[in-house]
Each structure stands twice: as structure tokens, then as C-alpha cells.
């Protein structure tokens, strides 16, 4: 009866999902079979977020707006470690939009989930952020310092990183 | 004031190449991105180019991307716009005008009077 | 590309009257609150010269007889009383998203 119930349940909040994500990869979390965690596929999973990389092409708003019908937004990074995930899956030769912005010009960078912009867990290029005029943040590749950030116009398409909470049911 | 001044335009073969030039004064042009904006005759504007302050970040919409190049001397106060491999529907007056962003937009707030590239044989 | 198309393409207004030119785009042009759609009045002759930004505010040193309304993809120029020196090309465009795209003009002119 118990396990009939959590059965029920997993399915009730699976169909919410499936509106934006038909389909869910999931896996067993630690020893107990009641836990499992989940993330769209194909996105890839680390710690407790989902990832999706974006290929199409947007403006940074449009590229927000894109996460947001998938029930995410633009990446937040949040320490080296993370950042190290996510470089594994990009490609060396594209610029990919990150949650992150200054809307007003004033180095006031602020991300999309208002998550506290900490000076001390940035990976800007050297001589990055250099313009007032350039308000987004990517990451890209560059030969001499590996993977890092840089401003550039919002407007400009770019390819994009979608963050989600894992789903558990 | 702000001035923008552009030159350069003429009368060119199919397959030419141009150069074109915008002086400003009244500006601090250093910190300032900078576009190019084209009107043929009789249609709507179409945007043509634009480079940031310091010079590293350009952008082009298809329709020029590899034939046109924007750039830059701060230290003469100038913009300038080569055009390569001139097709007749590259035929307008060209404009450059300074950039102001808004939030995550834009507006192109100060225009030059122009000048005419015409591509014919 | 977002496509802007104004209506109508022109305009006979008599002076002092009100002039309402409008500006559909092919997707949305909105963002937190803000929308990134521009007007510029051309002159035969001139360059464009900037009206209004972000839809509804009035760039310095125009008079406030320009307005501009509008959300998501329907925006409006309004002209409160039209006069003599208003007779131009008028022309929407919206920088959300590179390429930046014009609207075909709408040229107004005097009954």
C-alpha cells in the first residue's frame, strides 16, 4: 500500500514535467530506493542542477526567455568546479550566453536568479569585463587562457547554457 | 556638438572595393560603440555594422558579413567601413552613428549626413 | 529576423490634429519589463534623428507632442498636434536582437 501511494505520487509529479520535458533521465540517489533524482533528456547533470546547451542562436533576453519555458535559466556558476563541468561540454570555437548581466552599465553585475554576485568566484578573461557598453556575460574559449568570461552586447546571438534544479520524485 | 562626418562613397564597378570614412568631434569617440546604417533608394534602413569602444568586438548582419569590415582609430577620432566584392544592391547612402545601449537594447542617437556608395558598370 | 511592419504608409494629417502611425513586430521585443523598440523622424535630405527609445520615453530635446506606447509586439507613435515641421518619414526599429530591423516608414504629410 505504501508503495503504491509513492507510485502515485512519482507519477502525479512526473506529469507535471511533461509538458516542458517528455522524457526524464533518473537515477537512485545514495541507499535509499525511495530517492530518486532526475534531469531532462538529454540534458547532463551535476550535483544538484540539470544543464542544457542551447545551440540555437539568441540575443541574451530571448536566450533567458528560452530556458524559462523549459522551467530554468541562463547558468549561474557558482564555483571552479562547476564551471569545470560545463566546459565539457562546450565547443572551443562558440561563445555561449551565461545568466549573468548588468543592465544598467554600472558593473553592478547581477544574475538571473539573484543569486549574490561574488567578486571572488569569477572566471572573467584577463582585462574582462572591459566595456560599459556590453551588459551580458559569455564564455568562451581563448588559446591563451583557456575557458573564461567576457562581456559583449546583449543583442548579439549567441549559443546559451540552460541550469535547473534536479527533479526529485 | 556632436558631429559625425562621413566620405569616401562614390561610384563603383561591380566587384570594387570602398572605403569609407566617419570623422567625429564633440565626443569622448573612445568610449563610444559605433555603427554603420545603409539607405537605398527608396527602401528602409538596413543595418550594416557595428564595432564596440575599444575595437575588439565586431558585428555584421549576413548580408555583408565577409565582404564588410568595420574599424576603428581612436586616436584620430575615426570609423571606418571597407567594402569588398560591391554588389549593385550594396547602392545606398551610408551612415554612421554612435551607439547608446538601453538595458539590454539599444538606440543609435547621433547620425552623420551621409554618404553615397552607388555599385553600377 | 524580426520583421517590423508599420501602417499605414502614409499619412494626411491637418495641422494641429493628432497623427497615429503603428508598428507590428513578428515576435516579441520585451524583456523585464522594458521594450526595445525605437522611432526615428527622417526629413528629405537628413539623416534619422532620434524620437523615442524603449518605446515610450522621449529622447531629450523632443517636443512632447511625440509619444510612443506599445508592449510585446504592437507599438504605436503618436503626433498630439501635428505641425508644419513634422512633415517627414517616420520609422520604428527594434534592437532586441541582432540584426537590428527598420520598419518600412510611414511619411506623413499635410492635408
Known amino acids: 500500500n505504501f508503495m503504491y501511494s509513492k507510485t502515485v505520487k512519482r507519477l502525479s509529479k512526473l506529469r507535471e514535467y511533461q509538458q516542458y520535458h517528455p522524457s526524464l533521465t533518473c537515477v537512485m540517489e545514495g541507499k535509499d530506493i525511495e530517492d530518486w533524482s532526475c534531469c531532462p533528456t538529454p540534458w547532463t547533470s551535476f550535483q544538484s542542477s540539470c544543464y542544457f546547451i542551447s545551440t540555437g542562436m539568441q540575443s541574451w533576453t530571448k536566450s533567458q526567455k528560452n530556458c524559462s519555458v523549459m522551467g530554468a535559466d541562463l547558468v549561474v556558476i557558482n564555483t571552479r568546479e562547476e564551471q569545470d563541468f560545463i566546459i565539457q561540454n562546450l565547443k572551443r570555437n562558440s561563445s555561449y550566453f551565461l545568466g549573468l548581466s548588468d543592465p544598467g552599465g554600472r558593473r553592478h553585475w547581477q544574475w538571473v536568479d539573484q543569486t549574490p554576485y561574488n567578486e571572488n568566484v569569477t572566471f572573467w578573461h584577463s582585462g574582462e569585463p572591459n566595456n560599459l557598453d556590453e551588459r551580458c556575460a559569455i564564455i568562451n574559449f581563448r588559446s591563451s587562457e583557456e575557458w573564461g568570461w567576457n562581456d559583449i552586447h546583449c543583442h548579439v546571438p549567441q549559443k546559451s547554457i540552460c541550469k535547473m534544479k534536479k527533479i526529485y520524485i | 556638438e556632436v558631429q559625425l562626418l562621413e566620405s569616401g562613397g562614390g561610384l563603383v564597378q561591380p566587384g570594387g572595393s570602398l572605403r569609407l570614412s566617419c570623422a567625429a568631434s564633440?565626443?569622448?569617440?573612445?568610449?563610444?560603440?559605433m555603427s554603420w546604417v545603409r539607405q537605398a533608394p527608396g527602401k528602409r534602413l538596413e543595418w550594416v555594422a557595428t564595432?564596440?569602444?575599444?575595437?575588439?568586438?565586431?558585428y555584421y548582419p549576413d548580408s555583408v558579413k565577409g565582404r564588410f569590415t568595420i574599424s576603428r582609430d581612436n586616436s584620430k577620432n575615426t570609423l571606418y567601413l571597407q567594402m569588398n566584392s560591391l554588389r549593385a544592391e550594396d547602392t545606398a547612402v551610408y551612415y554612421c552613428?554612435?551607439?547608446?545601449?538601453?538595458?539590454?537594447?539599444?538606440?543609435?542617437?547621433?547620425w552623420g549626413q551621409g554618404t553615397t556608395v552607388t555599385v553600377s558598370s | 529576423d524580426i520583421v517590423l511592419t508599420q501602417s499605414p504608409d502614409s499619412l494626411a494629417v491637418s495641422l494641429g490634429e493628432r497623427a497615429t502611425i503603428n508598428c507590428k513586430a513578428s515576435?516579441?521585443?520585451?524583456?523585464?519589463?522594458?521594450?526595445?523598440v525605437n522611432w526615428y523622424q527622417q526629413k528629405p535630405g537628413q539623416p534619422p534623428k532620434l524620437l523615442i527609445y524603449?518605446?515610450?520615453n522621449l529622447e531629450s530635446g523632443i517636443p512632447d507632442r511625440f509619444s510612443g506606447s506599445g508592449s510585446g509586439t504592437d507599438f504605436t507613435l503618436t503626433i498630439s498636434s501635428l505641425q508644419a515641421e513634422d512633415v517627414a518619414v517616420y520609422y520604428c526599429?527594434?534592437?532586441?536582437?541582432?540584426?537590428?530591423?527598420f520598419g518600412g516608414g510611414t511619411k506623413v504629410e499635410i492635408k
Open positions: 526599429q527594434q534592437s532586441d536582437e541582432d540584426p537590428w530591423t
Open positions: 524603449g518605446a515610450s
Open positions: 564595432i564596440n569602444s575599444g575595437g575588439d568586438n565586431t
Open positions: 552613428a554612435t551607439y547608446r545601449p538601453y538595458y539590454y537594447g539599444s538606440v543609435l542617437d547621433y
Open positions: 564633440g565626443i569622448t569617440f573612445s568610449t563610444y560603440t
Open positions: 515576435q516579441s521585443v520585451d524583456y523585464d519589463g522594458n521594450s526595445y
